[in-house]
Amino acid sequence: MRRERGRQGDSSSCERQVDRVNLKPCEQHIMQRIMGEQEQYDSYDIRSTRSSDQQQRCCDELNEMENTQRCMCEALQQIMENQCDRLQDRQMVQQFKRELMNLPQQCNFRAPQRCDLDVSGGRC
Protein backbone atom coordinates (compact mmCIF):
# COMPACT_ATOMS: atom_id res chain seq x y z
CA MET A 1 0.00 0.00 0.00
CA ARG A 2 1.43 3.37 -0.98
CA ARG A 3 1.65 6.11 1.61
CA GLU A 4 -1.31 8.48 1.82
CA ARG A 5 -0.68 12.12 0.96
CA GLY A 6 -3.54 14.16 2.39
CA ARG A 7 -6.88 13.02 3.77
CA GLN A 8 -8.96 13.00 0.60
CA GLY A 9 -7.35 15.07 -2.11
CA ASP A 10 -8.85 18.35 -3.23
CA SER A 11 -11.32 17.94 -6.10
CA SER A 12 -9.77 20.47 -8.49
CA SER A 13 -6.30 19.10 -7.76
CA CYS A 14 -7.47 15.58 -8.61
CA GLU A 15 -8.98 16.76 -11.89
CA ARG A 16 -5.67 18.35 -12.85
CA GLN A 17 -3.75 15.20 -11.97
CA VAL A 18 -6.09 12.92 -13.93
CA ASP A 19 -5.81 15.23 -16.94
CA ARG A 20 -2.03 15.01 -16.70
CA VAL A 21 -1.61 11.23 -16.55
CA ASN A 22 -1.88 8.89 -19.54
CA LEU A 23 -4.78 6.51 -18.87
CA LYS A 24 -4.49 4.66 -22.20
CA PRO A 25 -2.44 1.77 -20.76
CA CYS A 26 -5.20 1.22 -18.18
CA GLU A 27 -7.86 1.26 -20.88
CA GLN A 28 -5.86 -1.15 -23.02
CA HIS A 29 -5.16 -3.46 -20.08
CA ILE A 30 -8.84 -3.74 -19.18
CA MET A 31 -9.90 -4.20 -22.80
CA GLN A 32 -7.36 -7.00 -23.17
CA ARG A 33 -8.72 -8.64 -20.03
CA ILE A 34 -12.33 -8.59 -21.16
CA MET A 35 -11.46 -9.63 -24.72
CA GLY A 36 -9.58 -12.65 -23.37
CA GLU A 37 -6.43 -11.55 -25.24
CA GLN A 38 -8.32 -11.87 -28.55
CA GLU A 39 -7.32 -9.56 -31.39
CA GLN A 40 -10.81 -8.11 -31.76
CA TYR A 41 -9.98 -4.79 -30.23
CA ASP A 42 -8.15 -2.84 -32.91
CA SER A 43 -8.76 0.70 -31.67
CA TYR A 44 -5.23 0.55 -30.26
CA ASP A 45 -2.32 -1.56 -31.40
CA ILE A 46 -2.41 -3.78 -28.36
CA ARG A 47 -1.12 -7.01 -29.90
CA SER A 48 2.48 -6.01 -29.44
CA THR A 49 2.14 -5.47 -25.72
CA ARG A 50 1.21 -8.23 -23.24
CA SER A 51 -1.54 -7.51 -20.73
CA SER A 52 0.86 -7.78 -17.80
CA ASP A 53 3.06 -5.09 -19.38
CA GLN A 54 0.05 -2.87 -19.89
CA GLN A 55 -0.97 -3.42 -16.27
CA GLN A 56 2.46 -2.30 -15.09
CA ARG A 57 2.34 0.78 -17.31
CA CYS A 58 -1.15 1.52 -16.01
CA CYS A 59 -0.04 1.22 -12.40
CA ASP A 60 2.97 3.43 -13.12
CA GLU A 61 0.68 6.12 -14.53
CA LEU A 62 -1.74 5.92 -11.59
CA ASN A 63 1.27 6.12 -9.28
CA GLU A 64 1.85 9.64 -10.57
CA MET A 65 -1.32 10.81 -8.80
CA GLU A 66 -1.95 11.29 -5.10
CA ASN A 67 -3.01 8.00 -3.54
CA THR A 68 -6.36 9.27 -2.29
CA GLN A 69 -9.77 7.71 -2.70
CA ARG A 70 -10.97 10.92 -4.35
CA CYS A 71 -8.29 10.95 -7.05
CA MET A 72 -8.53 7.22 -7.70
CA CYS A 73 -12.28 7.53 -8.19
CA GLU A 74 -11.74 10.40 -10.63
CA ALA A 75 -9.27 8.29 -12.64
CA LEU A 76 -11.57 5.26 -12.78
CA GLN A 77 -14.48 7.44 -13.86
CA GLN A 78 -12.37 8.99 -16.61
CA ILE A 79 -11.36 5.54 -17.89
CA MET A 80 -15.03 4.49 -17.95
CA GLU A 81 -15.98 7.69 -19.74
CA ASN A 82 -13.21 7.29 -22.34
CA GLN A 83 -14.15 3.71 -23.20
CA CYS A 84 -17.93 3.95 -22.90
CA ASP A 85 -18.61 4.33 -26.63
CA ARG A 86 -16.41 1.33 -27.47
CA LEU A 87 -18.35 -1.07 -25.25
CA GLN A 88 -20.73 -2.87 -27.57
CA ASP A 89 -23.40 -4.22 -25.22
CA ARG A 90 -24.61 -4.31 -21.62
CA GLN A 91 -22.59 -7.45 -20.83
CA MET A 92 -19.39 -5.82 -22.05
CA VAL A 93 -20.13 -2.72 -19.98
CA GLN A 94 -20.54 -4.89 -16.86
CA GLN A 95 -17.32 -6.82 -17.60
CA PHE A 96 -15.40 -3.59 -18.12
CA LYS A 97 -16.80 -2.17 -14.89
CA ARG A 98 -15.84 -5.30 -12.94
CA GLU A 99 -12.27 -5.17 -14.23
CA LEU A 100 -12.11 -1.44 -13.54
CA MET A 101 -13.18 -2.02 -9.93
CA ASN A 102 -10.30 -4.48 -9.50
CA LEU A 103 -7.71 -2.07 -10.86
CA PRO A 104 -6.76 -0.30 -7.59
CA GLN A 105 -6.14 -3.64 -5.89
CA GLN A 106 -4.07 -4.91 -8.84
CA CYS A 107 -1.89 -1.81 -8.51
CA ASN A 108 -1.75 -2.13 -4.71
CA PHE A 109 -3.57 1.17 -4.18
CA ARG A 110 -6.44 2.09 -1.89
CA ALA A 111 -9.85 1.31 -3.39
CA PRO A 112 -11.96 4.46 -3.58
CA GLN A 113 -14.99 4.56 -1.32
CA ARG A 114 -18.46 5.40 -2.65
CA CYS A 115 -17.18 5.75 -6.21
CA ASP A 116 -19.99 6.03 -8.78
CA LEU A 117 -18.82 4.52 -12.06
CA ASP A 118 -22.13 5.21 -13.82
CA VAL A 119 -20.90 8.57 -15.00
CA SER A 120 -21.67 8.55 -18.70
CA GLY A 121 -25.17 10.02 -18.50
CA GLY A 122 -26.83 6.73 -19.42
CA ARG A 123 -24.61 6.08 -22.47
CA CYS A 124 -23.02 3.09 -20.74
Partner: antibody, heavy 123, light 110 residues
Protein backbone atom coordinates in the same frame (compact mmCIF):
# COMPACT_ATOMS: atom_id res chain seq x y z
CA UNK B 1 -39.06 -6.57 11.06
CA UNK B 2 -36.23 -4.04 11.35
CA UNK B 3 -36.52 -1.84 14.43
CA UNK B 4 -34.33 0.99 15.72
CA UNK B 5 -35.23 2.49 19.08
CA UNK B 6 -33.38 5.56 20.38
CA UNK B 7 -33.16 6.64 23.99
CA UNK B 8 -31.18 9.06 26.16
CA UNK B 9 -32.43 12.39 24.89
CA UNK B 10 -33.52 15.19 27.20
CA UNK B 11 -32.86 18.70 28.44
CA UNK B 12 -29.25 19.61 29.17
CA UNK B 13 -27.42 22.86 29.90
CA UNK B 14 -24.83 24.29 27.49
CA UNK B 15 -21.48 22.62 28.12
CA UNK B 16 -23.19 19.49 29.46
CA UNK B 17 -23.10 15.90 28.23
CA UNK B 18 -25.57 13.26 27.07
CA UNK B 19 -25.24 9.71 25.81
CA UNK B 20 -27.72 8.54 23.21
CA UNK B 21 -28.37 4.84 22.68
CA UNK B 22 -30.01 2.95 19.83
CA UNK B 23 -31.24 -0.63 20.23
CA UNK B 24 -31.40 -2.47 16.90
CA UNK B 25 -33.34 -5.63 16.11
CA UNK B 26 -34.66 -7.57 13.12
CA UNK B 27 -31.39 -7.66 11.14
CA UNK B 28 -27.75 -8.70 11.50
CA UNK B 29 -26.44 -5.53 13.13
CA UNK B 30 -22.75 -6.37 12.70
CA UNK B 31 -23.00 -6.35 8.88
CA UNK B 32 -24.20 -2.77 8.48
CA UNK B 33 -22.70 0.69 8.69
CA UNK B 34 -24.74 2.75 11.17
CA UNK B 35 -25.36 6.50 11.15
CA UNK B 36 -26.70 9.28 13.40
CA UNK B 37 -28.69 12.01 11.65
CA UNK B 38 -30.28 15.02 13.35
CA UNK B 39 -33.00 17.51 12.58
CA UNK B 40 -33.28 20.85 14.37
CA UNK B 41 -36.86 22.03 15.02
CA UNK B 42 -38.43 23.19 11.74
CA UNK B 43 -35.18 22.63 9.82
CA UNK B 44 -33.76 20.10 7.38
CA UNK B 45 -31.79 16.91 7.93
CA UNK B 46 -28.13 16.99 9.00
CA UNK B 47 -25.81 13.99 9.01
CA UNK B 48 -23.83 13.70 12.25
CA UNK B 49 -21.63 10.59 12.15
CA UNK B 50 -21.02 7.20 10.49
CA UNK B 51 -19.46 4.08 11.94
CA UNK B 52 -18.21 1.08 9.95
CA UNK B 53 -19.46 -2.46 10.63
CA UNK B 54 -16.54 -3.38 12.89
CA UNK B 55 -16.16 0.09 14.39
CA UNK B 56 -12.76 0.59 12.78
CA UNK B 57 -13.71 3.69 10.77
CA UNK B 58 -15.70 6.70 11.94
CA UNK B 59 -16.61 9.92 10.15
CA UNK B 60 -18.01 13.06 11.77
CA UNK B 61 -19.65 16.31 10.83
CA UNK B 62 -16.99 19.02 11.23
CA UNK B 63 -18.95 20.96 13.86
CA UNK B 64 -19.21 17.92 16.19
CA UNK B 65 -15.76 16.39 15.65
CA UNK B 66 -13.89 16.31 18.95
CA UNK B 67 -17.10 16.76 20.97
CA UNK B 68 -19.19 13.76 19.86
CA UNK B 69 -18.10 10.11 19.74
CA UNK B 70 -19.95 7.42 17.83
CA UNK B 71 -19.49 3.82 18.97
CA UNK B 72 -21.18 0.45 18.72
CA UNK B 73 -21.47 -2.86 20.55
CA UNK B 74 -22.17 -5.59 18.01
CA UNK B 75 -22.74 -8.19 20.73
CA UNK B 76 -25.61 -6.06 22.06
CA UNK B 77 -26.77 -4.79 18.63
CA UNK B 78 -26.47 -1.28 19.99
CA UNK B 79 -25.29 2.07 18.62
CA UNK B 80 -24.22 5.00 20.82
CA UNK B 81 -23.52 8.71 20.53
CA UNK B 82 -21.58 10.32 23.37
CA UNK B 83 -22.21 14.07 23.21
CA UNK B 84 -19.94 16.39 25.21
CA UNK B 85 -19.58 20.19 25.38
CA UNK B 86 -23.12 20.56 24.09
CA UNK B 87 -24.19 23.84 22.47
CA UNK B 88 -27.57 25.42 21.78
CA UNK B 89 -27.14 24.64 18.09
CA UNK B 90 -27.00 20.91 18.89
CA UNK B 91 -30.70 21.07 19.82
CA UNK B 92 -32.45 18.61 17.51
CA UNK B 93 -34.23 15.31 17.12
CA UNK B 94 -31.50 12.67 16.74
CA UNK B 95 -32.26 9.70 14.50
CA UNK B 96 -30.47 6.37 14.55
CA UNK B 97 -30.35 4.98 11.01
CA UNK B 98 -29.14 1.86 9.23
CA UNK B 99 -26.77 2.76 6.41
CA UNK B 100 -26.81 0.56 3.30
CA UNK B 101 -23.22 1.43 2.31
CA UNK B 102 -21.56 -1.89 1.47
CA UNK B 103 -18.43 -1.54 -0.64
CA UNK B 104 -16.24 0.82 -2.62
CA UNK B 105 -18.73 1.15 -5.45
CA UNK B 106 -21.96 1.84 -3.59
CA UNK B 107 -23.25 4.88 -1.72
CA UNK B 108 -24.55 5.89 1.69
CA UNK B 109 -28.30 5.47 2.02
CA UNK B 110 -30.47 5.26 5.09
CA UNK B 111 -33.07 2.55 4.65
CA UNK B 112 -34.35 2.30 8.23
CA UNK B 113 -34.85 5.09 10.78
CA UNK B 114 -35.73 5.14 14.45
CA UNK B 115 -38.51 7.36 15.79
CA UNK B 116 -35.92 9.88 16.99
CA UNK B 117 -35.01 11.24 20.43
CA UNK B 118 -35.14 14.97 21.22
CA UNK B 119 -32.06 16.67 22.64
CA UNK B 120 -32.63 20.19 23.97
CA UNK B 121 -29.62 22.30 24.97
CA UNK B 122 -30.76 25.31 26.95
CA UNK B 123 -29.99 27.15 30.17
CA UNK C 1 -26.83 27.21 3.58
CA UNK C 2 -26.71 23.65 2.19
CA UNK C 3 -24.00 22.63 -0.29
CA UNK C 4 -26.66 20.63 -2.17
CA UNK C 5 -29.22 23.00 -3.63
CA UNK C 6 -32.91 22.10 -3.89
CA UNK C 7 -35.88 24.36 -4.70
CA UNK C 8 -37.51 25.29 -1.36
CA UNK C 9 -41.03 24.54 -2.58
CA UNK C 10 -42.96 23.16 -5.52
CA UNK C 11 -46.63 22.56 -6.15
CA UNK C 12 -48.77 20.65 -8.62
CA UNK C 13 -52.24 19.20 -9.01
CA UNK C 14 -53.16 15.55 -8.37
CA UNK C 15 -52.31 13.28 -11.29
CA UNK C 16 -49.56 15.55 -12.57
CA UNK C 17 -45.84 14.86 -12.77
CA UNK C 18 -43.22 16.84 -10.84
CA UNK C 19 -39.43 16.82 -10.76
CA UNK C 20 -37.29 17.99 -7.88
CA UNK C 21 -33.71 18.97 -8.64
CA UNK C 22 -30.64 18.64 -6.44
CA UNK C 23 -27.48 20.34 -7.63
CA UNK C 24 -24.01 19.93 -6.18
CA UNK C 25 -20.40 19.81 -7.34
CA UNK C 26 -17.83 17.34 -8.63
CA UNK C 27 -16.71 16.40 -5.14
CA UNK C 28 -20.20 15.29 -4.08
CA UNK C 29 -22.92 14.44 -6.62
CA UNK C 30 -20.41 14.36 -9.48
CA UNK C 31 -18.48 11.45 -8.01
CA UNK C 32 -20.80 9.77 -5.56
CA UNK C 33 -24.20 8.13 -5.34
CA UNK C 34 -27.37 10.07 -4.55
CA UNK C 35 -30.31 9.01 -2.39
CA UNK C 36 -33.72 10.63 -1.85
CA UNK C 37 -35.99 10.75 1.21
CA UNK C 38 -39.61 11.65 1.85
CA UNK C 39 -40.62 13.13 5.19
CA UNK C 40 -44.31 13.35 5.99
CA UNK C 41 -45.35 15.75 8.78
CA UNK C 42 -44.31 14.61 12.27
CA UNK C 43 -42.71 11.35 11.06
CA UNK C 44 -39.19 10.06 10.44
CA UNK C 45 -37.90 10.26 6.86
CA UNK C 46 -38.38 7.33 4.47
CA UNK C 47 -35.94 6.17 1.79
CA UNK C 48 -37.33 6.58 -1.74
CA UNK C 49 -34.29 6.18 -4.03
CA UNK C 50 -30.73 4.96 -3.48
CA UNK C 51 -27.63 4.63 -5.69
CA UNK C 52 -29.08 7.30 -8.02
CA UNK C 53 -31.87 5.24 -9.57
CA UNK C 54 -32.75 2.23 -7.41
CA UNK C 55 -36.03 1.89 -5.51
CA UNK C 56 -36.27 -0.06 -2.24
CA UNK C 57 -39.00 -2.69 -2.08
CA UNK C 58 -42.34 -1.15 -1.24
CA UNK C 59 -41.67 2.15 -3.04
CA UNK C 60 -44.04 2.52 -6.00
CA UNK C 61 -42.61 3.02 -9.48
CA UNK C 62 -44.23 6.46 -9.58
CA UNK C 63 -40.98 7.56 -7.92
CA UNK C 64 -37.82 7.62 -10.02
CA UNK C 65 -34.31 8.99 -9.72
CA UNK C 66 -31.70 10.09 -12.22
CA UNK C 67 -28.29 11.73 -12.18
CA UNK C 68 -26.32 13.64 -14.77
CA UNK C 69 -23.00 15.29 -14.00
CA UNK C 70 -23.26 17.20 -10.73
CA UNK C 71 -27.07 17.24 -10.56
CA UNK C 72 -29.69 14.69 -9.56
CA UNK C 73 -33.43 14.64 -10.08
CA UNK C 74 -36.34 12.98 -8.31
CA UNK C 75 -39.41 12.40 -10.46
CA UNK C 76 -42.90 11.73 -9.15
CA UNK C 77 -45.70 10.83 -11.58
CA UNK C 78 -49.41 10.48 -10.91
CA UNK C 79 -49.28 12.84 -7.95
CA UNK C 80 -51.46 11.94 -4.98
CA UNK C 81 -52.49 14.04 -1.99
CA UNK C 82 -50.51 11.62 0.20
CA UNK C 83 -47.32 12.70 -1.59
CA UNK C 84 -47.50 16.10 0.12
CA UNK C 85 -44.29 16.12 2.15
CA UNK C 86 -40.71 17.38 2.35
CA UNK C 87 -38.19 15.71 0.01
CA UNK C 88 -34.44 15.61 0.67
CA UNK C 89 -31.50 14.51 -1.49
CA UNK C 90 -28.26 13.23 0.04
CA UNK C 91 -24.80 12.19 -1.08
CA UNK C 92 -21.24 11.78 0.19
CA UNK C 93 -18.77 14.62 -0.28
CA UNK C 94 -15.26 13.28 -0.85
CA UNK C 95 -13.54 16.59 -0.04
CA UNK C 96 -15.41 17.06 3.25
CA UNK C 97 -15.52 13.34 4.18
CA UNK C 98 -19.15 13.83 5.13
CA UNK C 99 -22.67 13.00 4.02
CA UNK C 100 -24.50 16.09 2.76
CA UNK C 101 -28.25 16.63 2.66
CA UNK C 102 -30.02 19.12 0.45
CA UNK C 103 -32.03 21.84 2.17
CA UNK C 104 -35.26 20.02 1.34
CA UNK C 105 -38.19 20.74 -0.98
CA UNK C 106 -41.74 21.11 0.30
CA UNK C 107 -44.16 19.53 -2.18
CA UNK C 108 -47.73 20.79 -2.07
CA UNK C 109 -50.42 18.84 -3.92
CA UNK C 110 -53.05 21.41 -4.82
Amino acid sequence: EVQLVESGGGLVQPGGSLRLSCAASGFKFSTFYMTWIRQAPGKGLEWVANIKQDGSEKDYLDSVRGRFTISRDNAKSSLYLQMNSLRAEDTAVYYCTRNGLQDSYSGDFFDHWGQGTLVTVSS
Amino acid sequence: QSVLTQPPSISAAPGQKVTISCSGTGSNIGHNYVSWYQQLPRTAPRLLIFDNTKRPSGIPDRFSGSKSGSSATLGITGLQTGDEAHYFCATWDADLSAVLFGGGTKLTVL
